[in-house]
Interface confidence: low
């Protein structure tokens, strides 16, 4: 069940880490907006998609709601079926 007051990406952190496959696309969408060059490289350096997503999530505590919306929008564009599935859960 959704937790009130939490952003979608925080509510579904574990599922996103496990199920997002197109991480590179997300990085390109977020680069220069909410990700610095160093952050972008740090995520890219991770060996697997789950570890890339885990690394990406290590930066999100410093993000405000609008920044998290950018990630959600990128997810909708890259893996809309996943977002829809999580919204139904």
């Amino acid at each position: 069940a959704a937790k009130p007051g939490l952003h979608f990406i925080d509510q579904h952190r574990a599922a996103l880490i496990a199920r997002v496959t197109n991480v590179e696309w997300l990085l390109d969408a977020l680069y220069g907006k909410v990700l610095t060059d160093e952050q972008y490289q740090a995520v890219r350096a991770e060996p697997t998609n789950p570890s890339k997503m885990r690394k990406l999530f290590s930066f999100t505590p410093a993000w405000n709601w609008t920044c998290k919306d950018l990630l959600l929008q990128a997810l909708r564009e890259s893996q809309s079926y996943l977002v829809e599935d999580l919204e139904r859960s």
Partner: antibody
């Protein structure tokens, strides 16, 4: 400058609970996570848990059944509560801010709260 | 859990010396290795994060290196205030874990 100031009791009896307040300054709890670490004579430094900027929590599985971390962003305060204390919980308890980027590290620490569990 | 091992629990050195403190992880932690200094009064300070990045305000005589499972902290030109206990910590995998500490004592 960034500061974390802790307050809490020094002596607690077995089976009772511990409450520590960590009051932060010069940064916002709505933008930074805060971790809790303890240092006991027998086990060294142990990571206990974290409360993220959005309010979600993650706990070390060894403590998940008796640990609660909460916060009040408007008061810049985090509350750490641990139940069912035993002498083995005698330790120094620290709050520490999560650093930016590059995994999880702790860039500023509180002064520590020394806890003795004894009857 | 990932075990962090600091092989030396204590080291003796003199003012002006260069010392290296080692830390080993039980599995690959990439570069997510951090170093802290603890003074006798309990005060803890971050020195190095992500293996080699020096935290703001930390003197340049502190440096870190390594990757994977083997890491080291080097302090060059030791000063009086450097005699303290040093801990490594992995920030790669939950639960985050620490080494047992290395106490740097004056010779």
């Amino acid at each position: 400058q960034v500061q974390l100031k802790q307050s809490g009791p020094g002596l607690v009896q077995p089976s009772q609970s511990l409450s520590i307040t960590c009051k932060v300054s010069d940064f916002s709890l709505s933008h930074y996570g805060v971790h809790w670490v303890r240092q006991s004579p027998g086990k060294g430094l142990e990571w206990l848990g974290v409360i993220w900027s959005g309010g979600t929590t993650e706990y070390n599985e060894a403590f998940i059944s008796r640990l609660t971390i909460s916060k009040d962003n408007s008061k810049s305060q985090i509350l750490f509560r641990m139940n069912s204390l035993q002498p083995a919980d005698t330790a120094i308890y620290y709050c520490a801010r999560k650093g930016d980027f590059y995994g999880d590290y702790f860039d500023y620490w509180g002064q520590g709260t020394t806890l003795t569990v004894s009857s | 859990d990932i075990q962090m091992t600091q092989t030396s629990s204590s080291l003796s050195a003199s003012l002006g010396d260069r010392v290296t403190i080692s830390c080993r992880a039980s599995q690959d932690i990439s570069n997510y290795l951090n170093w802290y200094q603890q003074r006798p009064d309990g005060t803890v300070k971050l020195l190095i994060y992500y293996t080699s990045k020096v935290h703001s305000g930390v003197p340049s005589r502190f440096s870190g290196s390594g990757s994977g499972t083997d890491f080291s902290l080097t302090i060059s030109n030791l000063e009086q205030e450097d005699f303290a206990t040093y801990y490594c910590q992995q920030g790669n995998t939950r639960p985050f874990t620490f080494g047992g500490g290395t106490k740097l004592e004056i010779k």
